[in-house]
């Protein structure tokens, strides 16, 4: 005869363990049913009655089969610098990640605890290492023969255009200005960008320069002194 299937609660055979999705209740000394994800134990089992489970209440969750008396509280609502990438449900906690243009300065088990804005490289400085979901942008001074005239977290240093006759030589923050005759090699219009990090995927490809720090390319006068060595705007 086949062995009979034991229904919870049941006393396990000496030396054996409870089955999958069951737990051993020390008080009842029985194998009892666990509650499914999205539930918690409302009434613990006894020798004669199985665990009574209840659905997780408002804004609480359990992710695993369990016998906890209360569901876990979902984390607080995402802050203004974050987006909710996973909603709080009975079976999963809320996950907040940094919104475009920000990176995670302090992460937690899932999602981010503290977001910070991505550093913007000032004119004269370009992006050496782009920002990611968890790391800030690294800026570097534009090497001789290159420039950046934007305040941006994505623009790299671009080569100066090569002129037949130079009207104004380029510097780190301004392109060379040619005389009316065409340049030998004209740069394509628009800034050169590094690929956007995941956390900035919805940013516009051309960040608007800040007038106070990013001069217009139409100026024909040499620029003033170089910006500070960090090459980034204050956060």
């Amino acid at each position: 005869l086949p062995a009979q299937v034991a229904f919870t609660p049941y006393a396990p055979e000496p030396g054996s363990t409870c089955r999958l999705r069951e737990y051993y209740d020390q008080t009842a000394q029985m194998c009892c049913s666990k509650c499914s994800p999205g539930q918690h134990a409302k009434v613990f089992c006894t020798k004669t009655s199985d665990t009574v489970c209840d659905s997780c209440e408002d804004s609480t969750y359990t992710q695993l089969w369990n016998w906890v008396p209360e569901c876990l509280s979902c984390g607080s609502r995402c802050s203004s610098d974050q987006v909710e990438t996973q909603a709080c449900t009975r079976e999963q906690n809320r996950i907040c990640t940094c919104r475009p243009g920000w990176y995670c300065a302090l992460s937690k088990q899932e999602g981010c605890r503290l977001c910070a804005p991505l550093r913007k490289c000032r004119p004269g400085f370009g992006v050496a290492r782009p920002g990611t979901e968890t790391s800030d942008v690294v800026c570097k001074p534009c090497a001789p023969g290159t420039f950046s005239n934007t305040t941006s977290s994505t623009d790299i240093c671009r080569p100066h255009q090569i002129c037949n006759v130079v009207a104004i030589p380029g510097n780190a923050s301004m392109d060379a200005v040619c005389t009316s005759t065409s340049p030998t090699r004209s740069m394509a219009p628009g800034a050169v960008h590094l690929p956007q990090p995941v956390s900035t995927r919805s940013q516009h490809t051309q960040p608007t320069p800040e007038p106070s720090t990013a001069p217009s390319t139409s100026f024909l006068l040499p620029m003033g002194p170089s910006p500070p060595a960090e090459g980034s705007t204050g956060d």
Partner: antibody, heavy 117, light 106 residues
Framework: EVQLQQSGAELVKPGASVKISCKAS????????MDWVKQSHGKSLEWIGD????????SYNQKFKGKATLTVDKSSSTAYMEVRSLTSEDTAVFYC??????????WGAGTTVTVSS | ENVLTQSPAIMSASLGEKVTMSCRAS?????MYWYQQKSDASPKLWIY???NLAPGVPARFSGSGSGNSYSLTISSMEGEDAATYYC?????????FGGGTKLELK
């Protein structure tokens, strides 16, 4: 379009049982709990219980424990509620509702159960 | 169980009038949920997480409150708003509904 299609009205005798169905369409059936709500004529709403179609785990309002039994058939995306030992107190409209996680965003049209000899 | 008391039970309002109905819980709740029901129809989700309007709900509706006291407000009554409104809590089991507020057009 998300829809919950409930079975038709039932006229049953006292002491008998009735099994109401609720067929879900337009979404993944196992993604959301299904809840059942009772509304007696001219009265408010009473939560009976819910079932997680994924794990087939249930939770009940203590008042309806032993009175109602919730089950699902995942293959047909259908939830069922059986109500037993019917009395005149069980004459009501019974609704199934999709539980979006602490609110019922879609409701069935309701099944009227009349208990009469 | 957490008893939800809605007041008034019945009220009437003229077109354009501001309407406020309340829902008091015997124990504090995290959020309140509201449903609209018209005669011989199923309830419809109206407001969730205390103040979020369900899709398709006109902007003249709003929800507010915390703890034991919550309310639903219509800034300017329209004919189609005549219905019964129920509040519901999910903070403690069994999940309970209020007795409803029947809103009629004056």
């Amino acid at each position: 379009e998300v829809q919950l299609q409930q079975s038709g009205a039932e006229l049953v005798k006292p002491g008998a049982s009735v099994k109401i169905s609720c067929k879900a369409s337009g979404y993944t059936f196992t993604d959301y709990n299904m809840d059942w709500v009772k509304q007696s004529h001219g009265k408010s709403l009473e939560w009976i219980g819910d079932i997680n179609p994924n794990y087939e785990s249930t939770s009940y309002n203590q008042k309806f424990k032993g009175k109602a039994t919730l089950t699902v058939d995942k293959s047909s995306s259908t939830a069922y509620m059986e109500v037993r030992s019917l009395t005149s107190e069980d004459t009501a409209v019974f609704y199934c509702a999709r539980d979006k996680g602490w609110y019922f965003d879609v409701w069935g049209a309701g099944t009227t159960v009349t208990v009469s000899s | 169980e957490n008893v939800l008391t809605q007041s008034p039970a019945i009220m009437s309002a003229s077109l354009g009038e501001k309407v406020t109905m309340s829902c008091r819980a015997s124990s504090s709740v995290k959020n309140m949920y509201w449903y609209q029901q018209k005669s011989d129809a199923s309830p419809k989700l109206w407001i969730y997480y205390t103040s979020n309007l369900a899709p398709g709900v006109p902007a003249r509706f709003s929800g507010s409150g915390s703890g034991n006291s919550y309310s639903l407000t219509i800034s300017s009554m329209e004919g189609e708003d005549a219905a019964t409104y129920y509040c519901q809590q999910f903070t403690s089991s069994p999940y309970t509904f209020g007795g409803g507020t029947k809103l009629e057009l004056k």
